[in-house]
């Protein structure tokens, strides 16, 4: 990546890290308005299985691991990217390394959910306060989950699917910050680990993933009012360990692994027409990216 100043543009889709043959340090940004990609400042350490989020206009890269020819190191790191300066800076690390982590943001606080350290599959969850640069453990999940999809809706944190070390999961649970407790919600129709999970129009979407046998292209959404999961149109590509985000009322899925190939494909879901379309390609195929969108 380049170290020059990034153009000051609004609402880009950032993709950080990932895996192709080894963990990657790329940071790239896609501009849906003109279809262009920007090559930005590399992560200071390559990582895959990380998560991305945006707080206060800053992009955070959370957890993951560095799988390289020199070895394999799970990451407890939290790093912050400033789009205005095109620079990364380290923040306080989490209490434990978390590969294949999920993250969500409530009231400007980052929640780091699950993930693995070696063969330990975490059910622990911790919250980061950017103003204090501090992490604090909160109530653990009811289930150990890596490859967990995390989304926030109505100030509640949802953890969806994943792998507990033995089984891939269709279960999901919800965290209530005021009570500091987790409760199970309706299970998905499909077992999904490494799915893309996001919120759009008051529904939680779970796209793709791996059911313990195959990569999936199916997509389902959870209606919090009816507490039911319903299938929507499938993606064009089967994919697990994909990146996902929402931009201007549409869902974007990036990359992933289809069981044979590391995908460069980026698909976009339009809820009005219930259709997926190929919108662009990443500069190279990869799985396990961290994805987030900058605010206006």
């Amino acid at each position: 990546g380049s170290m020059g100043h990034a153009p000051k543009v609004g609402r880009l889709i950032y993709t950080a890290g990932g895996y192709f043959r080894q963990s990657l340090s790329y940071l790239e940004a896609y501009n849906p308005s003109d279809g262009t990609w920007l090559d930005l400042a590399d992560l200071q350490v390559p990582r895959s299985g990380l998560a991305g989020c945006v707080v206060g206009g800053l992009l955070y890269a959370v957890g993951g691991r560095n799988n390289s020819p020199d070895g394999n190191t799970d990451s407890s790191a939290l790093d912050c990217y400033n789009p205005m300066t095109n620079q990364w800076s380290p923040c306080a690390p989490m209490s434990v390394p978390r590969n294949r982590i999920g993250v969500g943001v409530i009231d400007g606080h980052i929640y780091a959910v699950g993930g693995s350290h070696g063969c330990i599959h975490h059910n622990s969850v911790e919250r980061y306060e950017p103003e204090r640069d501090e992490w604090h453990l909160v109530a653990p999940m009811l289930t150990r989950r890596i490859g967990v999809g995390v989304a926030v809706l109505n100030r509640l944190l949802y953890a969806v699917g994943g792998f507990d070390g033995t089984n891939r999961l269709n279960s999901a649970e919800c965290y209530y910050p005021e009570r500091n407790e987790w409760r199970m919600i309706t299970a998905m129709n499909t077992i999904r680990s490494g799915a893309g999970v996001c919120v759009l129009h008051n529904c939680i979407y779970a796209a793709g993933g791996y059911d313990g046998q195959d990569q999936l292209n199916s997509v389902e959404r959870y209606d919090v009012e009816t507490e039911t999961w319903t299938f929507v149109a499938p993606m064009k590509h089967r994919r697990s360990a994909l990146g996902i985000t929402v931009h201007q009322g549409r869902i974007y899925v990036l990359g992933g692994y289809d069981g044979h190939t590391f995908l460069d494909s980026v698909e976009c879901y339009d809820p009005d027409t219930d259709t997926w379309s190929e919108v662009t390609r990443m500069t190279s195929g990869r799985s396990g990216v961290g994805v987030a969108v900058t605010m206006e």
């Epitope: 895996y19 799988n67 070895g71 070696g118 063969c119 330990i120 680990s193």
Partner: antibody
Framework: EVQLVESGGGLVQPGGSLRLSCAAS????????IHWVRQAPGKGLEWVAS????????LYAKSVAGRFTISADTSKNTAYLQMNSLRAEDTAVYYC???????????????WGQGTLVTVSS | DIQMTQSPSSLSASVGDRVTITCRAS??????VAWYQQKPGKAPKLLIY???SLYSGVPSRFSGSRSGTDFTLTISSLQPEDFATYYC?????????FGQGTKVEIK
Amino acid sequence: EVQLVESGGGLVQPGGSLRLSCAASGFAISASSIHWVRQAPGKGLEWVASIDPETGETLYAKSVAGRFTISADTSKNTAYLQMNSLRAEDTAVYYCVRRAAAKDWGVAAAYWGQGTLVTVSS
Amino acid sequence: DIQMTQSPSSLSASVGDRVTITCRASQSVSSAVAWYQQKPGKAPKLLIYSASSLYSGVPSRFSGSRSGTDFTLTISSLQPEDFATYYCQQSYSFPSTFGQGTKVEIK
């Protein structure tokens, strides 16, 4: 019944290449991580490489990193170990391994192939 | 890398004897330890996983235990078919590593 059958071993000169195959039956290789473990003549066991079916990520022992490549072809239900730049110290029986389906921590290797012998010598 | 130091490297015992083999990890590996039995010319067979769980089909005379970073495989009453080499393995952290083996021979 779960079965793993390795093939492709043989005699090769230092610097040469071989591709080992591991044909699986009784389960889909897409359903479990696959590992290669080797055993030099009269010696102990050494983990070599693995591939994760969910993320596609591969892991290698430092002794083989950059020279060996693990892969899988789900349509053939077969895993492979491509071995390049072979050295005398790579001489070993190579086993293809699948972890236990039972709850365990890490890689308790429940299913082993019969092994295939790789000899690197001039 | 985590070292698994196995002892003894060999032992002689008689049928009916109680046999104990120990593995010491160079750092914490929690309970992520497995034990294998290998006979000459054959692939290893899983006996114990998660330090103390008996794998399906393995006779109950085999057992495993953990005390901190010390792991023990016990054969309560040695049978003729138990003469073999035994290996421990940690899979707590990358890379997975094995002990150097213990050969159990007939006295």
